[in-house]
Amino acid sequence: LKGQEFAPSHQQVYAPLRADGDKPRAHLTVVRQTPTQHFKNQFPALHWEHELGLAFTKNRMNYTNKFLLIPESGDYFIYSQVTFRGMTSECSEIRQAGRPNKPDSITVVITKVTDSYPEPTQLLMGTKSVCEVGSNWFQPIYLGAMFSLQEGDKLMVNVSDISLVDYTKEDKTFFGAFLL
Amino acid sequence: LKGQEFAPSHQQVYAPLRADGDKPRAHLTVVRQTPTQHFKNQFPALHWEHELGLAFTKNRMNYTNKFLLIPESGDYFIYSQVTFRGMTSECSEIRQAGRPNKPDSITVVITKVTDSYPEPTQLLMGTKSVCEVGSNWFQPIYLGAMFSLQEGDKLMVNVSDISLVDYTKEDKTFFGAFLL
Amino acid sequence: LKGQEFAPSHQQVYAPLRADGDKPRAHLTVVRQTPTQHFKNQFPALHWEHELGLAFTKNRMNYTNKFLLIPESGDYFIYSQVTFRGMTSECSEIRQAGRPNKPDSITVVITKVTDSYPEPTQLLMGTKSVCEVGSNWFQPIYLGAMFSLQEGDKLMVNVSDISLVDYTKEDKTFFGAFLL
């Protein structure tokens, strides 16, 4: 019995069937970021909760040291939301002083690291200027897309300013991936 | 014949196979919200179109009384976008009056209700300060992530200010979920 | 052997099984938009990279002439992010001149074209007022949802102002779809 017997008639080659409940999946939630050493010239990576509350990893998808480890090759949907929170915007201060107002910005990057490849690959980026009039502000950046990943690839979430990340609630800042 | 015969060689235990087209799925679209009574101290829940236009429910995923009812346990991807529209920002009025400008905000929460559990669980939250200079403004908040749900769980979308929701078009404000 | 033998006991009718790796999928990334003729009274459509870098199409999902062509009927998750970048906001200029400040806006629409249907269908819209104080600004609009599509349907991404799209990086502006 071959998997392709179930394929639509126009489809000749057919990959083996597998149960959906067995696929690698993870949903990670925010935890407080303690000050750590970050790589120079690289946005700092967030670390995550992987088993408490809404967070989980399953079917060989493991979380370790800020990375999600991809256990098998395939197409994955990867997503993250980071909620940022600031007490003021330097942009408005610059504006008041009458100097040209280059905006502040907040950025989230989902990055893939492949050990055999020297440079990390930026899979997704959400970046937004912040030039708020208010004395305090907050807003989310959401990202999500599908990528072909290889067994052993590692995923992380990098942010432009780790001190602005809202880590007060697990539903505000999160990171996940699942094999399609 | 057991499902695991199709499993990759490194996989011992294997859940039964099932066809993708048979999985519970729903995409709901916005409808006009008439003023109604809401629970005290809780963001009001939106109600939705479930069968006209782009909206649908299928494979035992049912919509009733503002809730999506989860018909079988498993991992679901859940998403929503709410477009908000305001005629002014009180923040700007407060600012003009020279008082400290606590920003207005808009918030979307996707909430899970489990009958056996006393408190609803907030799965996803998108929250954004609104301190617009313009006399009218509009913007979406998008959310999406994967969660492990149980048969009988109910999902709803709550918003901070129901009177700011743009319900003029089905592509602007929507809510969906599908079993992975 | 019938597909439904693997179905949960409460499920009578069951679609044929098929391997996940065989499903139509695409992730397209931004390329520089050269000035072209657009349809009158319709937002211009973006064109995309479909094979270099992070971009791919597979399993009969084809990209041609700004469209993703749907090769088989079913439920698809469709997503896009467009990052916009502006050097100024007319809104702030209007404001300084003391005239009423109707905001500028940025809009992304994911549109379905069905040859047998005269009018395109707007599946998803993200629209945001832009009334920035800063002299330059940038921000993403993200969209994603599930839709029932028919074989032969075509998908495109339309934007309100093609000259504001940030096409500098493949992780900032993208478009994808996959059969569930």
Partner: antibody, heavy 118, light 107 residues
Framework: QGQLVQSGAEVKKPGASVKVSCQAS????????MHWVRQAPGQGLEWMGW????????NYAQKFRGRVTMTRDTSISTAYMELSRLRSDDTAVYYC???????????WGQGTLVTVSS | DIQMTQSPSSLSASVGDRVTITCRAS??????LNWYQQKPGKAPKFLIY???RLQSGVPSRFSGSGSGTDFTLTISSLQPEDFATYYC?????????FGQGTRLEIK
Amino acid sequence: QGQLVQSGAEVKKPGASVKVSCQASGYTFTAYYMHWVRQAPGQGLEWMGWINPNSGGTNYAQKFRGRVTMTRDTSISTAYMELSRLRSDDTAVYYCATGGSWEGFDYWGQGTLVTVSS
Amino acid sequence: DIQMTQSPSSLSASVGDRVTITCRASQSISSYLNWYQQKPGKAPKFLIYAASRLQSGVPSRFSGSGSGTDFTLTISSLQPEDFATYYCQQSDSTPITFGQGTRLEIK
């Protein structure tokens, strides 16, 4: 089903002020903006402004700024509209109205006739 | 401010007639247009929102169309209870503004 009940008719002299009340029932008062619309005899509808009952924030039409004040008392689900320095051309029926969003007013008060006459 | 202009100001028609009222905005208001019906001595009644979407409980003989600056309200087959004054209203931006009204009378 929501309902808005307004205070009774008023007769005022030019230069005086009038305060019209609007009591809401059947829906969550604080969740929906309350608008005020007036209609002079034989004339069309004219929007005056709104109040956000939750925050107390207001937005007034330019024509009425400086003369109109909209307030609310959430404990009794009531909105108020006060118009000062009344003139004879302020003679009109004043309506409170609310809706699920900006897109239309579902519920209207029965109207309050304010007559300004010396 | 956005000006709303209705035409005609008044019209006479008979029961069973098809009637169209137009409303023009002084600038684009997308589809943020609503229609009301008002009878003498009564508060307005909400009919149509978002240019074309029927408010719950409104008979299907009422329909709306248009976007941008030009809009129409159509009554496909006039009934005795439809004789009233009709107003369009834009909800695109403040100040919210109404058309001057169209009075529909029995011929």
